[in-house]
């Protein structure tokens, strides 16, 4: 039961995390104009990975895409790549983990297969989360560098736009969304890997051994047993029925096409 909960929670946490990574990647507010030095400005600039926006004081916003690939800073391209890799890995991880969920039965898929899929998706989520955290951190570092350079009366380039000493850019909302989302995806991935250990069937066949204790005798009859991994609530050895790989709480007479629990 605990294995199912851990796996399910890992899936949900990763799903939220990947949704957050997608949201952060699409958001325009990766860097926002620092208004500390110029509170009377009527023009507010903010920039994303794909376009830059200008908001007039009275509310009208105009955004312009970066219609160049070669003209953009290499760091920005690297951040884009990291975020996209994170999304792709996360999406594949989600797809794999859906089929790996213990509460969903597809045909006669064995626990070992589910365990492998759970581990695969877990690793994918971990790498996806790391990609997002790395991407956001690289961008944040770029901002910090440019912030202090512009403070020191230097001219810097950000997001393919000319930035004079007048305007400094600071962390936008997308960075925080990205960090949190990356962290959630990472946590979800770790949970999936933990769940995998609880799913893995470590089968051991014991020979018939007769023990004689004082007072009474207990005979252990031969039969296949499923060894407990010590994870989750599956602490008792459970007898395998019909030589299959299913435990008592998963009895299924005939696997049907659409057999979901």
């Amino acid at each position: 039961m605990a294995v199912t909960a851990c796996q399910g929670l890992g899936f949900v946490v990763s799903l939220i995390g990947i949704a957050g990574i997608i949201a952060a990647t699409c958001m325009d507010q990766w860097s926002t104009q620092d208004l500390y030095n110029n509170p009377v400005t009527a023009v507010f600039n903010y920039q994303g990975l794909w376009r830059s926006c200008v908001r007039e004081s009275s509310g009208f916003t105009e955004c312009r895409g970066y219609f160049t690939l070669l003209g953009l800073p290499a760091m920005l391209q690297a951040v884009r790549a990291l975020m996209i890799v994170g999304i792709v890995l996360g999406a594949i991880g989600l797809l794999v983990s859906i089929f790996a969920l213990k509460c969903i039965r597809i045909g006669s898929m064995e626990d070992s297969a589910k365990a492998n899929m759970t581990l695969t998706s877990g690793i994918m989520f971990i790498v996806s989360g790391l990609c997002a955290i790395a991407g956001v951190s690289v961008f944040a570092n770029m901002l910090v560098t440019n912030f202090w350079m512009s403070t020191a009366n230097m001219y810097t380039g950000m997001g393919g736009m000319v930035q004079t000493v007048q305007t400094r850019y600071t962390f936008g909302a997308a960075l925080f969304v990205g960090w949190v989302a990356g962290g959630l995806t990472l946590i979800g991935g770790v949970m999936m890997c933990i769940a995998c250990r609880g799913l893995a069937p470590e089968e051991t066949n014991y020979k018939a051994v007769s023990y004689h204790a004082s007072g009474h005798s207990v005979a252990y009859k031969p039969g296949g047993f499923k060894a407990s991994t010590g994870f989750g609530s599956n602490t008792k050895n459970k007898k395998i029925y019909d030589g299959g790989a299913r435990t008592e709480d998963e009895v299924q007479s005939y696997p049907s096409k659409h057999d979901y629990v």
Epitope: E56, G59, F60
Partner: antibody, heavy 115, light 112 residues
Framework: QIQLAQSGPELKKPGETVKISCKAS????????MNWVKQAPGKGLKWMGW????????KYADDFKGRFDFSLETSARTAYLQIKNLKIEDTATYFC????????WGQGTSVTVSS | DIVMTQAAPSVPVTPGESVSISCRSS???????????LYWFLQRPGQSPQLLIY???NLASGVPDRFSGSGSGTAFTLRISRVEAEDVGVYYC?????????FGSGTKLEIK
């Protein structure tokens, strides 16, 4: 097409209150802020401030803080300028103009304050 | 506050000729996003102002291409080629980079 239709001319006495309306049509009202501009007889243009038609947030130029009030009736797509405790020097034509760039203007409302 | 200065109160011109109207700002209107927040308006006699040029050099919709805007961060020029009778009125420059938005005093275009 985009239009800003302002209310008719007003003749008021000092100390009274006037409320001018500016009804927008032809565009999404809440997407663009509304500016108010004053033009005294024979003088140039003076920016009074703006109202954000989405949030209702207002910003006033220093000379127009206190007696001047911008408001909205979003359902009627209308912005209002209210001037309280009118003074002789408030005699002017008041224009509403769309967004910071003031790309569209109302026809103006003439307010005459005389005792 | 940013002060907008239009030195010439009026400019006489013969129809068909070209004319330039100048405007200066007390502070650069060039923003870090590459835009210069300088606008030109024409107020014909008895009418409300009309936007001619936005962000220093962009022609507003419906405005004839006889009008053009240019300038640097602080010095700006509105040029009208082949002046027509309908171009008479007062030309105002305005900045909306910072609060409060400020207008120049205006330059009146008169036909000789």
């Amino acid at each position: 097409q985009i239009q800003l239709a302002q209310s008719g001319p007003e003749l008021k006495k000092p100390g009274e209150t006037v409320k001018i309306s500016c009804k927008a049509s032809g565009y999404s009202f809440t997407n663009y802020g509304m500016n108010w501009v004053k033009q005294a007889p024979g003088k140039g243009l003076k920016w009074m401030g703006w109202i954000n038609t989405y949030s209702g947030e207002t910003k006033y130029a220093d000379d127009f803080k206190g007696r001047f009030d911008f408001s909205l009736e979003t359902s009627a797509r209308t912005a209002y300028l209210q001037i309280k405790n009118l003074k002789i020097e408030d005699t002017a034509t008041y224009f509403c103009a769309r967004r910071d760039a003031m790309d569209y203007w109302g026809q103006g409302t003439s307010v005459t304050v005389s005792s | 506050d940013i002060v907008m200065t239009q030195a010439a109160p009026s400019v006489p011109v013969t129809p068909g000729e070209s004319v330039s109207i100048s405007c200066r700002s007390s502070k650069s209107l060039l923003n870090s996003n590459g835009n210069t927040y300088l606008y030109w308006f024409l107020q014909r006699p008895g009418q409300s102002p009309q936007l001619l040029i936005y962000r220093m050099s962009n022609l507003a919709s419906g405005v004839p291409d006889r009008f053009s805007g240019s300038g640097s961060g602080t010095a700006f020029t509105l040029r009208i080629s082949r002046v027509e009778a309908e171009d008479v009125g007062v030309y105002y420059c305005m900045q909306h980079l910072e609060f409060p938005f400020t207008f120049g005093s205006g330059t009146k275009l008169e036909i000789k």
